[in-house]
Structures are given as structure tokens and as C-alpha cells.
């Protein structure tokens, strides 16, 4: 009888099934959908989380102007193909053999095509702009307090290294959080900015992925920070390839 058997849960991913029968009596927590035994000491990859979500029962200015190449996830949910390490495969296809290329956060970056479509590499999203509007408050938040609280949140809740939170901008009621992480900067064991942004997005929507924790209670100097709108822009290391028809639509 081990400590693992007493507390066989996955604090960082509630979309898992855990059992205390791993090697040496260790706890093993397998993600819904993929069945992969995930690391419960860190964030689960967005690809595995999307796969789990699709398999789950259905009931349940200093401001930055996004670049012309910024992507927004307009396609909604899909059941992704994940690579051997649980990351998005560069090419995704649906059941009707419609295919498209995605970036490292799983957002479509090309027009849709057929099975002949080639996606040579998984293009890294190296810059994420999280654009929030907070509900009206008596007065504006203190910028430095807001900055410190959001940096603390990403460091402590999402385990994202502080160097990857590039900036926090604020012009009431708009808050922008910039995450930056080049391929060369990301060391083994570092949380990916795409995964951190996805956990944050789900927290903001009141759909926390953390096991047993209360929802996100964001406060700045005791004052609740309630978000009423979220937009996330994704910038890739290589600009996306869409036809002119889409760009002028």
C-alpha cells in the first residue's frame, strides 16, 4: 500500500481516468480519448486535451494591434490527430477526407483541401496575444498590480516560466497578455505557451481543467477581475498560407 494508492488523481487534468496499478504500484492517469498516461505534475498538451474533450460525453495602448498574419481560432472544436508525443500533427483531416494544416496550437493555417494536401512541418506558434475585456469596475486597476497578478497566475497556476510572459498591457477595460516562446528558447520540461494559453482560456470560461480546484478567482488588490470577453491571436514563426479569396471575404 503506497502513497500513490491513497491519492491517485491527476491535479492538472481532470479529463483522465486514474488507477494505482502502474509499475511499482505507481498511480497512472490515462487521458480520455487517447489513452496516454499523462504527466500530472505539469500541463497536458492541448492536442490530448482536445481529443479528451471530443471523447467526453456531450452533456455535460500601449495596446498591441495584432499582426496581419495573426490567426484566430474560428473553426471551433475538432477531434485532432496527435503525434507520438501528444502534440498536434501538422496535417489534420476530418471524416469526410477534408484536410488542412495546423500550427503548434492546433489552429488552421491553410485553406482546406483534400487528402493530397501536404503539410511539411508543424509550424511553431511563437507569439500569443490574449486580449481580454473586464467587466466595469469602480475605477481602473493599477497597471503594475495587474501586471504582477497576471504574471503570478501564469507562473504558479500554469507553471509557465516568467520569461515567456513578454508583456501585460492595460487600457481600461482592455487587458492584453503577450506570451512569447521561440523554438530555441523552449527547454525540455518547459510548459508550452500554447498549452498555458489553452488552460487560461478554459479557466476564464469557467471550464477549469484542473482536478478539484475551484474555478479561477482572479483578484487585483482584493478587487475581483471578471472577464466578459476573450480573444486569442496566434502568431506563427512562418506566416500562414491562405488564398486571397479568404482574405478579402
Amino acid at each position: 500500500h503506497t502513497a500513490a494508492q491513497d491519492n491517485c488523481t491527476c491535479p492538472t487534468n481532470k479529463m483522465t481516468v486514474c488507477s494505482p496499478d502502474g509499475p511499482g504500484g505507481r498511480c497512472q492517469c490515462r487521458a480520455l480519448g487517447s489513452g496516454m498516461a499523462v504527466d500530472c505534475s505539469t500541463l497536458t498538451s492541448k492536442c490530448l486535451l482536445l481529443k479528451a474533450r471530443m471523447s467526453a460525453p456531450k452533456n455535460a495602448r500601449t495596446l498591441v494591434r495584432p499582426s496581419e498574419h495573426a490567426l484566430v481560432d474560428n473553426d471551433g472544436l475538432y477531434d485532432p490527430d496527435c503525434d507520438p508525443e501528444g502534440r498536434f500533427k501538422a496535417r489534420q483531416c476530418n471524416q469526410t477526407s477534408v484536410c488542412w494544416c495546423v500550427n503548434s496550437v492546433g489552429v488552421r493555417r491553410t485553406d482546406k483541401g483534400d487528402l493530397s494536401l501536404r503539410c511539411d512541418e508543424l509550424v511553431r506558434t511563437h507569439h500569443i496575444l490574449i486580449d481580454l475585456r473586464h467587466r466595469p469596475t469602480a475605477g481602473a486597476f493599477n497597471h503594475s498590480d495587474l501586471d504582477a497578478e497576471l504574471r503570478r497566475l501564469f507562473r504558479e497556476r500554469y507553471r509557465l516560466h516568467p520569461k515567456f510572459v513578454a508583456a501585460v498591457h492595460y487600457e481600461q477595460p482592455t487587458i492584453q497578455i503577450e506570451l512569447r516562446q521561440n523554438t530555441s528558447q523552449k527547454a525540455a520540461g518547459d510548459v508550452d505557451i500554447g498549452d498555458a494559453a489553452y488552460y487560461f482560456e478554459r479557466d476564464i470560461k469557467g471550464e477549469s481543467l484542473f482536478q478539484g480546484r475551484g474555478g479561477l478567482d482572479l483578484r487585483v488588490r482584493g478587487e475581483p477581475l471578471q472577464v466578459e470577453r476573450t480573444l486569442i491571436y496566434y502568431l506563427d514563426e512562418i506566416p500562414p498560407k491562405f488564398s486571397m479569396k479568404r482574405l478579402t471575404a
Epitope: A3, A4, G22, G24, R26, Q28, M36, P84
Partner: nanobody, 120 residues
Framework: QVQLQESGGGLVQPGGSLRLSCAAS????????MSWVRQAPGKGPEWVSY???????YYPDTVKGRFTISRDNSKNTLYLQMNSLRAEDTAVYRC??????????????WGQGTQVTVSS
């Protein structure tokens, strides 16, 4: 990037033997713990053997005494020798780059798998 390619699966009669291989690339094989995971039709995945980088092995009771995991670091290859096979061993067998934390068993990557069917 990590690549794991299994081979050696097939159809075998109850009581027979098979040897599975897994060719690994894209990471330091000799310094990595590895495991074999199987998934039977309609069931969830289950680990059936585990070997540390130092050669320590673990088996669940369901296969203990029948399955043997081994590795050849010079060839970057993982093996699973399966003897006294039973119908309930029918499954897709995958090798996985894995590790043990203080409390959890983790699979960091796995292969596509090879089908093993035990039937007369």
C-alpha cells in the same frame, strides 16, 4: 522528434510465442525508461512491462512469468518476448518512452503499435 516503430506481431496459436521489437530514434534511448502497452478491442490501454534505463523490470500480475522485456542500447531497440500466449493477450501492442515519478507512471511518447492475435 521521437519515433517508435514496432514490429513482430501476428497470428499465433494459444500456448505459442512471439517476440516483438521496437526501433527507437529521436532521443537518447540508453538513458530512457521504456515500456510496452497493449490495448485490447473495446478496452483501455494497459502497461504490460516496464524497463528502466538501468535494466530494472516491472510486470503486472497478468503477464508475470510469461512476458520478458529487454533492451539492446547498441541497437536502440526494445524487445518483448511473449510466451504461453492466451486468447486474452490479443491486442495492439505499443512501445512507449516512459518514466516513473515519485507517485506516477508517465508515457511521454508511444508508437503506432503492432497487432497480436492469439487464436486457434
Amino acid at each position: 522528434q521521437v519515433q517508435l516503430q514496432e514490429s513482430g506481431g501476428g497470428l499465433v496459436q494459444p500456448g505459442g510465442s512471439l517476440r516483438l521489437s521496437c526501433a527507437a530514434s529521436g532521443f537518447t534511448f540508453s538513458g530512457s525508461d521504456m515500456s510496452w502497452v497493449r490495448q485490447a478491442p473495446g478496452k483501455g490501454p494497459e502497461w504490460v512491462s516496464y524497463i528502466t534505463s538501468g535494466g530494472t523490470t516491472y510486470y503486472p500480475d497478468t503477464v508475470k512469468g510469461r512476458f520478458t522485456i529487454s533492451r539492446d542500447n547498441s541497437k536502440n531497440t526494445l524487445y518483448l518476448q511473449m510466451n504461453s500466449l492466451r486468447a486474452e493477450d490479443t491486442a495492439v501492442y505499443r512501445c512507449a518512452k516512459s518514466r516513473l515519478t515519485d507517485s506516477h507512471y508517465v508515457e511521454d511518447a508511444w508508437g503506432q503499435g503492432t497487432q497480436v492475435t492469439v487464436s486457434s
